[in-house]
Amino acid sequence: MMTGTIETTGNISAEKGGSIILQCHLSSTTAQVTQVNWEQQDQLLAICNADLGWHISPSFKDRVAPGPGLGLTLQSLTVNDTGEYFCIYHTYPDGTYTGRIFLEVLESSVAEHGARFQIP
């Protein structure tokens, strides 16, 4: 039975040219996290394997930095980076948990963080 929940940074906004940290946290389960995949719609951004380390997709290697922790840092943001991002937690024995973050990249300097929310 999957008892865990994923807490994410929720809906966030950031300035064009700036950077943002995408962060998820898995709680309420003793399952072992074996891997976290970071994906944007149909694209793979990065993989963090608990044992083997990080894989960064070459399409994003100049703009994505691993961490902090299991999170992902997006740099040199463009308006095209606006959209949904998913953290996919592969765990044993529970299986897969998915968290969603919506990022809006703004032209203006008015960029405020949204509230945190949970996805069961």
């Epitope: 074996t34 891997q35 694209q43 993989i47 394997n49 894989h55 691993p66």
Partner: antibody, heavy 119, light 107 residues
């Protein structure tokens, strides 16, 4: 230049163990994950597992968990793969390979070590 | 485990031919696929990584495409040194798995 040089061919009896070594040179050993892949005669490639010398973490194909042990000696930039309780179907060429920095493909391979299990 | 199924398992072609090898994953693996070339008695060599990126020193006649579950390796004009066996590999999830191989033979 990057080189992965493996130990020589081995002939073992069923039930025995074998330890294959892979000496790395031409790159910073601790910054790359070392993997082991085997190929039975006339067959395809099978991933055994990988060892990250930086973190000390290792990931195994469940098929080999409990029989395969991956280790490294950082002082001599050498990776090892030990396979115990050998069976005849473990007869194969065993390759070490390096995964690229921040990539999970295998960009450099050793020359292979033939392990023959026969009574 | 994720299964990688290559087709065809073997093919005969002539120098100068355009050759296409396909690889189908049993589930979505995004672009986490590499292609290798192996010649008899030798270790595999990396050709393509992350589905479509040509590895350093690999001739431009080799190209990779696809995402999700369907991937293709194309050799635009087969050369004598290209007769070999080709493998796809997924690294989306451990255990990493390979296709069964496609042997490209001289017609």
């Amino acid at each position: 230049q990057v080189q992965l040089v493996q130990s020589g061919a081995e002939v073992k009896k069923p039930g025995a163990s074998v330890k294959v070594s892979c000496k790395a040179s031409g790159f910073t050993f601790t910054e790359y994950t070392m993997h082991w892949v085997r190929q039975a005669p006339g067959q395809g490639l099978e991933w055994i597992g990988g060892f990250n010398p930086n973190s000390g973490g290792s990931s195994y194909n469940q098929k080999f968990k409990g029989r395969a042990t991956l280790t490294v000696d950082k002082s001599i930039s050498t990776a090892y793969m030990e396979l115990s309780r050998l069976r005849s179907d473990d007869t194969a060429v065993y390759y070490c390979a390096r995964s690229s920095y921040y990539r999970f493909d295998l960009d450099y391979w050793g020359q292979g070590t033939t392990v023959t299990v026969s009574s | 485990d994720i299964q990688m199924t290559q087709s065809p398992s073997s093919l005969s072609a002539s120098v100068g031919d355009r050759v296409t090898i396909t690889c189908k994953a049993s589930q979505d693996v995004k672009t986490a696929v590499a292609w290798y070339q192996q010649k008899p008695g030798k270790a595999p060599k990396l050709l393509i990584y992350s589905a479509s990126f040509r590895y350093t020193g690999v001739p431009s006649r080799f190209s990779g495409s696809g995402s999700g579950a369907d991937f293709t390796l194309t050799i635009s004009s087969l050369q004598p040194e290209d007769f070999a066996t080709y493998y796809c590999q997924q690294h989306y999830l451990t255990p990493w798995t390979f296709g069964q191989g496609t042997k490209v033979e001289i017609k």
